[in-house]
Interface confidence: low
């Protein structure tokens, strides 16, 4: 029978008695930066070219005996997971291995940097098809290593890395913390995050998605036909590198941003048991397990969006947090979240010629997060329309007044420390869904976009009594671009998008009691692009 991990990443339409999805990534080259490998193993023989690159530190300990099979163990297994004949994800992908880890699995930042430079030069000398670089390693945070990954990513290379096996915030490690890298955590057959001894998979906002990473059967370096089970985020990253190779082989023109959005879109949603993660990390950690798309073609018509969380602002009174989209993505909305509920909202602002999402802490607050909704919207022209605090008691409102522009998101930002506690709720006048409404003491920001065939609509879900969480989801065929709470709810901690659902969180209802201000309304802006749909129909 198929190993559990291949079964898990395979959509039902490919399933038979064997794992045989179409096109095994044959147009893609995967670079593996790891230990040495046993290239004559029957799983990977003829599929992996061992480059002459080697940059590793000396092994520790005077009595360390170099045993070839142990030196090759990690890299051989990962090469097998990516492209192995029997147990590999992308059976058609060709690989090149660079040795940056020694026989004890240790490497250096400098060795990895030189390895990445080797790949960049190889790419310049002999350009091939799409490149995927697999970095199944993790060390302490390194600005210089993250910068090197950014350079390579901006040259069109897809980098996939392990989140790390430290049961910790992946943002504290490199290259996992590099925003341009696709960072992968590990789950097991029961969709529990993987435990490894007293530690386990890393988590948090720097993880893009999870993939199978426990008891993964793959090539063993003990003999040329041996197999072994290994566990860790390296194995998880190898699955995603294989899936990326499959996707890029089917659509070689995909950009990194498009590939990442597709990986997220086609993942299994909300299947991980989040109780394993520390409480403060649950909301930040994506509940996504990687899977191959049900069809390698025809996904181009969809409007893809993802949620990007900022780092925590810290608790100082004027602290802010900034969330950014990738260069090829459009910021379509901006929201904020504070566990204490003390925040001064958020706004979209220009920074370096690109819109960013900035959230503001309030006096006495423990800090805030900014949450950006980042979307792929070709030929888009987006701008932010702002209305300052209103004079009238009707509250502040702003709409998209330019011809052909549609509302994709609403933000509000205020200077007063305790907005809402002394003002009656402001209700949206019915029949005016394409505008943002806020408190009279808040400035309101509307994200307005023009793009061919883009249409959006507003969906609301209100609950009269206090609830810790109110959600509203977009229907099939529509994509969530904006998520906010209607004003008048002083106890709201914030709003954020989870996949296609807008979540508005409130304080524990036992502390707020049921008051006239208990009503909580979640507001979702759902969009679709008729232009993208038509374009893909023409292609097929």
């Amino acid at each position: 029978s198929i190993p559990w991990n291949l079964e898990r990443i395979t959509p039902p339409r490919y399933r038979a008695d064997e794992y045989q999805p179409p096109d095994g990534g044959s147009l893609v080259e995967v670079y593996l930066l790891d230990t040495s490998i046993q290239s004559d193993h029957r799983e990977i023989e003829g599929r992996v070219m061992v480059t002459d690159f080697e940059n590793v530190p000396e092994e520790d300990g005077t009595r360390f005996h170099r045993q070839a099979s142990k030196c090759d163990s990690h890299g051989t297994h990962l090469a097998g997971v990516v492209s192995g004949r029997d147990a590999g994800v992308a059976k058609g992908a060709s690989m090149r291995s660079l040795r940056v880890l020694n026989c004890q699995g240790k490497g250096t930042v400098s060795g990895t940097l030189i390895g990445l430079e080797f790949i960049r030069k190889s790419q310049l000398v002999q350009p091939v098809g799409p490149l995927v670089v697999l970095l199944p390693l993790a060390g302490g945070y390194s600005r210089v290593l993250n910068a090197a990954c950014q350079r390579l990513a901006r040259a069109g290379v897809v980098l996939v890395t392990a989140a790390g096996n430290f049961r910790d915030d992946a943002c504290l490690y490199s290259p996992a913390s590099a925003p341009e890298v696709i960072t992968v955590g590990a789950t097991n057959a029961q969709d529990q995050p993987v435990t490894l001894g007293t530690l386990g998979t890393n988590f948090g906002r720097c993880v893009d998605l999870f993939a199978p990473g426990e008891d993964i059967i793959g090539a063993s370096s003990d003999c040329s036909t041996c197999f072994v089970s290994q566990s860790g985020t390296s194995q998880a990253a190898a699955h995603v590198a294989g899936i990326a190779a499959m996707m890029l082989s089917a659509e070689p023109e995909l950009t990194l941003a498009e590939l990442r959005q597709r990986l997220i879109h086609f993942s299994a949603k909300d299947v991980i048991n989040e109780a394993w993660f520390p409480e403060d990390q649950r909301v930040l950690t994506p509940n996504l397990v990687a899977a191959l798309p049900p069809s390698t073609h025809g996904a181009g018509w969809q409007l893809f969006c993802r949620t990007v969380w900022s780092a925590h602002s810290g608790p100082t009174r004027m602290a802010t947090a900034v969330a950014r989209c990738a260069p090829d993505e459009e910021l379509l909305s901006c929201s904020s979240f504070s566990r204490s509920g003390k925040r001064r909202g958020e706004r979209m602002e220009a920074q370096g010629g690109k819109l960013v999402c900035r959230a503001h802490n309030a006096f006495g607050g423990e800090g805030v997060y900014a949450i950006a909704r980042c979307c792929l919207l070709p030929q888009a022209n987006c701008s932010v329309h702002t209305a300052p605090p209103a004079e009238a008691s009707m509250g502040t409102r702003v709409h998209c007044h330019q011809q052909g522009h549609v509302l994709t998101g609403c933000s509000s930002h205020w200077e007063v420390e305790d907005l809402g506690t002394h003002k009656p709720p402001v209700l949206r006048p019915r029949g005016q869904p394409n505008q943002c409404v806020g408190h009279r003491e808040a400035s309101i920001h509307a994200s307005c976009c023009h793009a061919p065939g883009l249409e959006c609509k507003v969906k609301e879900h209100g609950i009269p009594a206090p609830q810790e969480q109110v959600t509203v989801a977009c229907e099939e065929g529509w994509t969530l671009t904006g998520c906010s709470a209607l004003p008048g709810t002083s106890h709201v901690l914030g709003a954020y998008a989870v996949d296609n659902t807008c979540v508005v969180r409130s304080r524990d209802v036992s502390t707020t009691g049921s008051t006239s201000e208990g009503a909580v309304t979640a507001v979702a802006i759902c969009c679709r692009s008729r232009h993208l749909a038509q374009a893909s129909q023409e292609l097929q």
Epitope: E7, L196, E214, A268
Partner: antibody, heavy 118, light 113 residues
């Protein structure tokens, strides 16, 4: 031949200890999770514990948590169940079972009887 | 924990006739990511260990005669023996392997009428 050979059952007093063994052959032991399942006299099947192929992850039924320890020796291709603080309600036939790596059991041992009585 | 409830507790069927056993789980065992029901059926003959018959609710284990079939999805499942043979006299158990603790039904005893 693909098989699981069990040993280690017997009569033990309440509060006592016992270690069950299960020797695997005919398949790649390290690649599969393994389980213990028990069956009290005249009763149905009760899952006791599971251990992943690498040995890194274990799970226990609430009724045995803190008293039983599942382990495996990959070099000996053997699964173990160390049973401590035994109670009368632990009396059962104990089966070891190979896991398909999903949680269903595609190969079973013949079973070994554990009797807890004073 | 997921509770598994089988019905009937015992069943007497004539040779060559159809036997049907039902199994109900207290929550869905359909897994969204792969559209599979994490449910298996086992046969246990007197004095023997159980034997896996069906997994994924409807997939026969290799070597199992095709008179055994499984069906159902979500919380309601059925094991059918299309034409009962003398060697099919046994106790049959359903099991969920959606999550730990893995749980079995209480068993259904199948006899010949």
């Amino acid at each position: 031949e693909v098989q699981l050979v069990q040993s280690g059952g017997g009569l033990v007093q309440p509060g006592g200890s016992l270690r069950l063994s299960c020797a695997a052959s005919g398949f790649t032991f390290n690649n599969y999770a393994m389980n213990w399942v028990r069956q009290a006299p005249g009763k149905g099947l009760d899952w006791v514990s599971t251990i992943s192929g690498s040995g890194g992850t274990t799970n226990y039924a609430d009724s045995v948590k803190g008293r039983f320890i599942i382990s495996r020796d990959s070099s000996k291709h053997t699964l173990y169940l160390q049973m401590n603080s035994l109670r009368a309600e632990d009396t059962a036939v104990y089966y070891c079972a190979k896991d398909s790596n999903w949680g269903n059991f595609d190969l079973w041992g013949r079973g070994t009887t554990v009797t807890v009585s004073s | 924990d997921i509770q598994m409830t089988q019905s009937p507790d015992s069943l007497a069927v004539s040779l060559g006739e159809r036997a049907t056993i039902n199994c109900k789980s207290s929550q869905s065992v359909l897994y969204r990511s792969n559209n599979r029901n994490f449910l298996g059926w086992y046969q246990q003959k007197p004095g023997q260990p159980p034997n896996l018959l069906i997994y994924w609710a409807s997939t026969r284990e290799s070597g199992v005669p095709d008179r055994f079939s499984g069906s159902g999805s979500g919380t309601d499942f059925t094991l059918t023996i299309s034409s009962l043979q003398a060697e099919d006299v046994a106790v049959y158990y359903c099991q969920q392997y959606y999550t730990t603790p893995y749980t079995f039904g209480q068993g259904t005893k199948v006899e010949i009428k």
